[in-house]
Each structure stands twice: as structure tokens, then as C-alpha cells.
Interface confidence: low
């Protein structure tokens, strides 16, 4: 039959060439002389001339060594024709399979691989995967089957078998416990890839394994005991800098310290913060310490890290003995701010109150008093007793010095310590109103027509407080009532001034007496300009000049 089974040819054949592979034969050769030829890639198309056929015998010839990694299979067509060139057979498919030889070494995809793994991980933890390729056949032969192995490990601490590599996948895993970044932060593994599933050619590469930091070292106080001296009353005062050492990676959360006062600070007098650069614990006073109440504090401070510990570690504790130093403390007025009610206008020399200070120091110090700020100069203070008396006229209505009925005075207490210290107190005098002001009309100048005049509405003001104000009463005096009339409107505290009789154009004085609910009377002279006009006027018109 005009059929050829697939032909297997090993690559890299040594010849001699041409080498006979197989014979094409047509059974039509009994009837006529047959000529054979082949076509296809490797014969008459690129790569031309690899194969040929003996024209008359049909022997298929190989002209040169084959390379499987270049072309693994050739598909040719065999042709049979008679002497006159007529085709005697259909083209026949010829398959030539190039069989593999182990002519390639494995190749790693990188010269150096990098990976990382946390320190302290359990054996079995995967680190990284390395890959090597081999161009040889790994399906039908073991020529291209790569087996991975670790040739060496540097450094060999804590021993030389810290890692293993999966023979067929190239996955590097931890095989031993004891990875400690603080001792060895990086390993260099020389890895091998061997073909023939481990029995053939070998190539090497490097795998660098970085050991990442875990919080497996606790911060430790160094030293553990401290003594400090702090002046009493100082707030925000730096008491002590506590120092710790931590073997974990500097500036990482596993290294950064967190401090906590765990004992000895019942009054919440202290606070501790971590210095961002030095990692020290900065112990400061949150409140002022009181020598007289407690002259020594013993604090206990614990340190941990920002990151939690990955294993159970002992917590380091520091002891800080804080000695409170006595300072001459300022006298303190009791109360710091004193409110006293006093009637305005009381006579000079009359007592207002006694305002004294206490000295926190244990010694009985002498305190002297004086007025520090008395804007109107209304008060005096006895330096020994702290007695405050009137030295001027207290005027509730004086808006320069009095706000909302209150007159504010600052007083000073000075002790006889060395050096002397001073304390201040605030005396708030609430001035009680007396009916010392009569009602006053506004405005005090008016303009009005002498024909069909508009009534003038004047506002009534009284600086005193109720009940020394409205209802008001009005009265015209000094014959002003002959031409004028004044009526109080109680609803809006106004007085309506009207012209009763004709007056020629001129300026007149209207004598208006207003009295308040407490009968405090006030006479006001209103300047009235009367104009020759009708009804409403703002300003007198110019006299008419005939032409």
C-alpha cells in the first residue's frame, strides 16, 4: 500500500549523511517505471534540503542532523509519477518525529531570586518560588524534567538546614525553627536545577531570603530605677527621661515604645509620652505637685511596643522616685473672686468688706495687702487686715468704670518669704442703685411752626434703675406754661410739647421740669426755635423779600 507509518529520528544524529530513513514504494511499479519525490517544509520549502528522496528507489534520505528544540516534527508529502509524468498515486502524508536527546541544561529564569519571610515562623512556611526551564522534552522523556535542590546556605546560623526546596515545584520553605532577624536578617541560598529528574545536567542560581522583623523582643528599661527632683506646683515639668533598649528593627512598630504608669499616681498628677526620635519615655507633671500634702511619689511605669508581641514576653517595669521640692508659694485669696453688694454714693471711709488671703506654706508668713487695680480710685485697703473701705464716690451710673452694675477691683497679697511671692484676688462690687438722677428729655433743641404747629415728641431718659424711673411727671415752670403745654405719654416714656399760642419767629427758652417715680426732679431748658410757617418744619424759611 501507498502508506508510510510515522518515522522517528533522534536529534543530533552523527550520520553518515545522507542517512536512509525509509523507502517509499508504490505497487504501481509493476506496470510502469515510477519516479518518487517529496514536498513540504524541510524538503522543497524552508528549511529546504533537510530531507530528500532517491528518485528511482524511493529511499527517504536525511541530509543533516536534526534539532528537536528547533523543529520537533516534519510533515512532508510523498509523490509517485510515471515516466510520462502522470501521477500514479495520491500525495502521501509522511510524518517525521524528531526524538529528544538531553542536549540542553536547565536555565533559571533569574540569576538571583529574592523573597522574604517573617522571623520565628513555623517549619513548613512557604517563602518563595524559583523557576528553571529546560528546552528538552519533559513529556516523553526525563531530559527536560527539572529537579530543584539547595546546594548551600549562607550564613549557616543557627545551622545549615534552615530551608528546603520542593523538588519539582521550586517552592522554598522554612524547614527549621529558629529564624531570628536580630541574628541573621538575610540568607543567601545557592540553588540547583538538575534535569533528568535530578540525574542529569545541573545549573545554579542564588535565592536571597530576607527575614522580616516580628515583635519578638520586648523593650527593656535601662536603667530600671530613677530618682528625680521636681519643684512643687510646676505643670508640664519634665520629671525624667526613661530609656529602653529593644532589639527589634529601629523605628518600626515592633521597636517603638508605649509607656504606661501602672502605679503610684493616684492623684493623676503625672503623664508619660514617647519621644518620636529617641524612643524615650518623657515623664512630665500633668498637675502641680503639693509639697505640703505629699513630698515624695513612687511611680511604676511599664513599657510595651506599638505592635503586639508575637510570643509571650515579660514586661519591663521601671521605678521612679519623685522628690517634691518646697517652693515659696504665693498667698491665695479666699475666694479668688469675691462679690460684695454696696450702695452707690456711700460716704468716704465706710467699710466695704474684709478680703484676705491664705499662704499655702507651712511657716506662718506675714501677708500684706494693697490695691493693684482700682480704675476710678474709689477704694482703699488696709495693708495688715485686708479691710476694704470707700475712698471716693461710688457712682453706679459712671459708664467709664461700671459694667452691668459691677465695679471690678484687683487686690494683691504679698508674703514675707524669700523671695516674696504675690497672689491676686478680684473684688467685684455690685453697686446698688440710689435715686440720684432725675429724668432728662431728648432732644433739648426743637424747631416748630407758629401756625398749625406740629407737637414735638421728646424722649425721657433716667440713668437710675427701676423703681427710680417711670412713671414720669412733667411740669412747665417760669411762665413757660403760658405758651406751651407738656404731657407725659406713660406708654413709651415720652413727653409731648405743644405750642398753645401764636409766637412770632424767634428763639425761646422752655423750662421743663421732669420728675421720676421717686419724685427726683430735674429742670431742663429746651431751646425752641419758632418759625413763620405752617405745620411741619425742619429749619426756619428765609424771610420773604418782595420784588
Amino acid at each position: 500500500d501507498w502508506v508510510v507509518a510515522p518515522i522517528s529520528v533522534p536529534e543530533n544524529g552523527k550520520g553518515p549523511f545522507p542517512q536512509r530513513l525509509n523507502q517509499l514504494k508504490s505497487n504501481k511499479d509493476r506496470d510502469t517505471k515510477i519516479f518518487y519525490s517529496i514536498t513540504g517544509p524541510g524538503a522543497d520549502s524552508p528549511p529546504e534540503g533537510v530531507f530528500a528522496v532517491e528518485k528511482e528507489t524511493g529511499w527517504l534520505l536525511l541530509n543533516k542532523p536534526l534539532d528537536r528544540e528547533e523543529i520537533a516534527k516534519y510533515e512532508l508529502f510523498g509523490h509517485a509519477v510515471s515516466e510520462n509524468g502522470a501521477s500514479v498515486e495520491d500525495p502521501m502524508n509522511i510524518s517525521i518525529i524528531v526524538t529528544d536527546q538531553n542536549d540542553h541544561k536547565p536555565k533559571f529564569t533569574q540569576d538571583t531570586f529574592r523573597g522574604s519571610v517573617l522571623e520565628g515562623v513555623l517549619p513548613g512556611t512557604s517563602v518563595m518560588q524559583v523557576t528553571a526551564t529546560d528546552e528538552d522534552d519533559a513529556i516523553h522523556t526525563y531530559n527536560g524534567v527539572v529537579a530543584y535542590s539547595i546546594h548551600s546556605q549562607e550564613p549557616k546560623d543557627p545551622h545549615d538546614l534552615m530551608f528546603t526546596i520542593h523538588r519539582s515545584t521550586g517552592t522554598i520553605s522554612v524547614i527549621s525553627s529558629g529564624l531570628d532577624r536580630e541574628k541573621v536578617p538575610e540568607y543567601t541560598l545557592t540553588i540547583q536545577a538538575t534535569d533528568m529528574d535530578g540525574d542529569g545536567s545541573t545549573t545554579t542560581a542564588v535565592a536571597v531570603v530576607e527575614i522580616l522583623d516580628a515583635n519578638d523582643n520586648a523593650p527593656v528599661f535601662d536603667p530600671q530605677k530613677y530618682e528625680s527632683h521636681v519643684p512643687e506646683n510646676a505643670v508640664g515639668h519634665e520629671v525624667q527621661r526613661l530609656t529602653v533598649t529593644d532589639l527589634d528593627a529601629p523605628n518600626s512598630p515592633a521597636w517603638r515604645a508605649t509607656y504606661l504608669i501602672v502605679g503610684g499616681d493616684d492623684g493623676d498628677h503625672f503623664t508619660i509620652a514617647t519621644h518620636p526620635e529617641s524612643n524615650q519615655g518623657i515623664l512630665t507633671t500633668r498637675k502641680g505637685l503639693d509639697f505640703e500634702a505629699k513630698n515624695q511619689h513612687t511611680l511604676y511605669v511599664e513599657v510595651t511596643n506599638e505592635a503586639p508581641f508575637v510570643l509571650k514576653l515579660p514586661t519591663s517595669t521601671a521605678t521612679i522616685v519623685v522628690h517634691v521640692e518646697d517652693v515659696n508659694e504665693a498667698p491665695v485669696f479666699v475666694p479668688p473672686s469675691k462679690v460684695v453688694e454696696v450702695q452707690e454714693g456711700i460716704p468716704t471711709g465706710e467699710a466695704v468688706c474684709v478680703y484676705t488671703a491664705k499662704d499655702p506654706d507651712k511657716e506662718n508668713q506675714k501677708i500684706s495687702y494693697r490695691i493693684l487695680r482700682d480704675p476710678a480710685g474709689w477704694l482703699a485697703m488696709d495693708p495688715d487686715s485686708g479691710q476694704v473701705t470707700v475712698a471716693g464716690t461710688l457712682d453706679r451710673e459712671d459708664e467709664r468704670f461700671v459694667r452691668n452694675n459691677i465695679y471690678e477691683v484687683m487686690v494683691l497679697a504679698v508674703d514675707n518669704g524669700s523671695p516674696p511671692t504675690t497672689g491676686t484676688g478680684t473684688l467685684l462690687l455690685t453697686l446698688i442703685d440710689v435715686n440720684d438722677h432725675g429724668p432728662v428729655p431728648e432732644p433739648r433743641e426743637i424747631t416748630i411752626c407758629n401756625q398749625s404747629p406740629e407737637s414735638q415728641v421728646l424722649n425721657i431718659t433716667d440713668k437710675d434703675l427701676s423703681p427710680h424711673t417711670s412713671p414720669f411727671q412733667a411740669q412747665l415752670t417760669d411762665d413757660s406754661d403760658i405758651y406751651w403745654m407738656a404731657e407725659v405719654n406713660e406708654k413709651d416714656d415720652t413727653v409731648v410739647l405743644s405750642l398753645k399760642k401764636f409766637l412770632k419767629q424767634d428763639t425761646y427758652d422752655v423750662h421743663l421740669s421732669l420728675s421720676d417715680h421717686g419724685n427726683k426732679e430735674q429742670l431742663t431748658v429746651i431751646r425752641a426755635t419758632v418759625c413763620d410757617c405752617h405745620g411741619h418744619v425742619e429749619k426756619c424759611p428765609d424771610p420773604w423779600k418782595g420784588g
Epitope: 533569574q110 536571597v208 522583623d213
Partner: antibody, heavy 123, light 113 residues
Framework: QVQLQESGPGLVKPSETLSLTCTVS????????INWIRQPPGKGLEWIGV???????NYNPSLKSRVTISVDTSKNQFSLKLSSVTAADTAVYYC?????????????????WGQGTLVTVSS | DIVMTQSPASLAVSLGERATINCKSS????????????LAWYQQKPGQPPKLLIY???TRESGVPDRFSGSGSGTDFTLTISSLQAEDVAVYYC?????????FGQGTKLEIK
């Protein structure tokens, strides 16, 4: 201010052991890795090895059989020992601090160097 | 070992002009996980230790003038001095820290033309 200072004998006989110390000030000795580098007169730089913050070491394979790097935390000092020296070991020897302990700090780059000490190997 | 090759071996540039030094590694210094190139540049003046200028191939060390810049990735790197000053006369070295042992280039001597 971080400072590194190398010290040791300026002259060593062939086949003897070269011993140098590196004194570190201005930073905790256990906070950063320390490298040793050498430079033969008129030539380039050669990395000798590194000691990590926890005491582990990595050495240049070309010198590994002869070199030892160690630390004495009580004295704030690192030491370099190179055995069986020959004239080819004549060089200025430097100690240098790595930028950090982490790979991501660029720990292979060296930011602070000592002034260096010249060691001559001669009989 | 990774071999570092610098070019040129020496270079003469006029004051105020640009100076360029090249460094080639025998294998890639780019680590795919963090996309960083493990390369540093140093300056060494006569009688002094080397001074770190650049790390991660392009990050300037604090205190280094901004006329110094580093570029490149993989196997090809460049140190550029944008406007040469008299005090820049020195030998410049590149160094890889991708894998052990750390290795340096042979150095480039920079002079004023």
C-alpha cells in the same frame, strides 16, 4: 552626630592575622548593621562583610575562609580579623554603617564611613 | 558575583557643564516585588572615605546638593551632575546591594576641563 573610627596596627607581617577595631559613637551600637570595606592603594573598593544588629554575619566568598567580624557591645566596638595575610591584603580598611536594618531602608547602601586606616602587609 | 562596569574610566568636564557617568550590572538589579533597583552611588575625594550620594538608584541622600541625580533601571544606570562645581572633582563609584557579595564598579575619575 554619628561617628565611626577605625584603629589597629599599621603594619602586619605576612601569614599573621590582621586585627582592626571600629568604635561607634552617637548611635546605639545595636541599632544598625556595620560593614567592612577595603581599598588597595590607588585601586577600587572591595566589600569584606557585614555584621547584623543581632550579631549574625555575611562575608565576601573570596575572603570567607580568612575573615571574622564580631562585636563587643560593652565597648561600643566592632572588630575585623583577617588571617594568613599577604601583600595583596595591603589596603585602607574602612568600617561603614548601613542605612538601616531593613531591606526597604536600603540597608546595602552605607551612609556613615570611618576615615579609614592604612594597613601594610610587609616583613 | 554580580559584576559592575562603569564608563568612562575618566572624564573631563568644564565648570558649569553637565557630567554623566554610566554603570552597567551583569544582571538586573530590579526586584519585582517592590519595583526598586538595588544600586547606590558614592563620591570619594582624595584622602577621604566614600560619601553616599544616591540609593535605590535615584533617591538622593539627605544633604546632597540637588545637582546630583541618579536614573536607570534593571542593568543600566546613570549618575548626572547637572552643573559641575569645582568641589565635585572626585572618583565616583556605583555599588549593587541586590545580592551578596556587595560589589562596586571600578570607579570613574571626574576632572575639570
Amino acid at each position: 552626630q554619628v561617628q565611626l573610627q577605625e584603629s589597629g596596627p599599621g603594619l602586619v607581617k605576612p601569614s599573621e592575622t590582621l586585627s582592626l577595631t571600629c568604635t561607634v559613637s552617637g548611635v546605639s551600637i545595636t541599632s544598625y548593621p556595620i560593614n567592612w570595606i577595603r581599598q588597595p592603594p590607588g585601586k577600587g573598593l572591595e566589600w569584606i562583610g557585614v555584621i547584623w544588629t543581632g550579631g549574625g554575619t555575611n562575608y565576601n566568598p573570596s575572603l570567607k575562609s580568612r575573615v571574622t567580624i564580631s562585636v563587643d557591645t560593652s565597648k561600643n566596638q566592632f572588630s575585623l580579623k583577617l588571617s594568613s595575610v599577604t601583600a595583596a591584603d595591603t589596603a585602607v580598611y574602612y568600617c561603614a554603617r548601613s542605612r538601616g536594618v531593613y531591606d526597604f531602608d536600603g540597608r546595602g547602601a552605607m551612609d556613615y564611613w570611618g576615615q579609614g586606616t592604612l594597613v601594610t602587609v610587609s616583613s | 558575583d554580580i559584576v559592575m562596569t562603569q564608563s568612562p574610566a575618566s572624564l573631563a568636564v568644564s565648570l558649569g557643564e553637565r557630567a554623566t557617568i554610566n554603570c552597567k550590572s551583569s544582571q538586573s538589579l530590579l526586584y519585582s516585588s517592590n519595583q526598586k533597583n538595588y544600586l547606590a552611588w558614592y563620591q570619594q575625594k582624595p584622602g577621604q572615605p566614600p560619601k553616599l550620594l544616591i540609593y535605590w538608584a535615584s533617591t538622593r541622600e539627605s544633604g546632597v546638593p540637588d545637582r546630583f541625580s541618579g536614573s536607570g533601571s534593571g542593568t543600566d544606570f546613570t549618575l548626572t551632575i547637572s552643573s559641575l562645581q569645582a568641589e565635585d572633582v572626585a572618583v565616583y563609584y556605583c555599588q549593587q546591594y541586590y545580592s551578596y557579595p556587595y560589589t562596586f564598579g571600578q570607579g570613574t575619575k571626574l576632572e575639570i576641563k
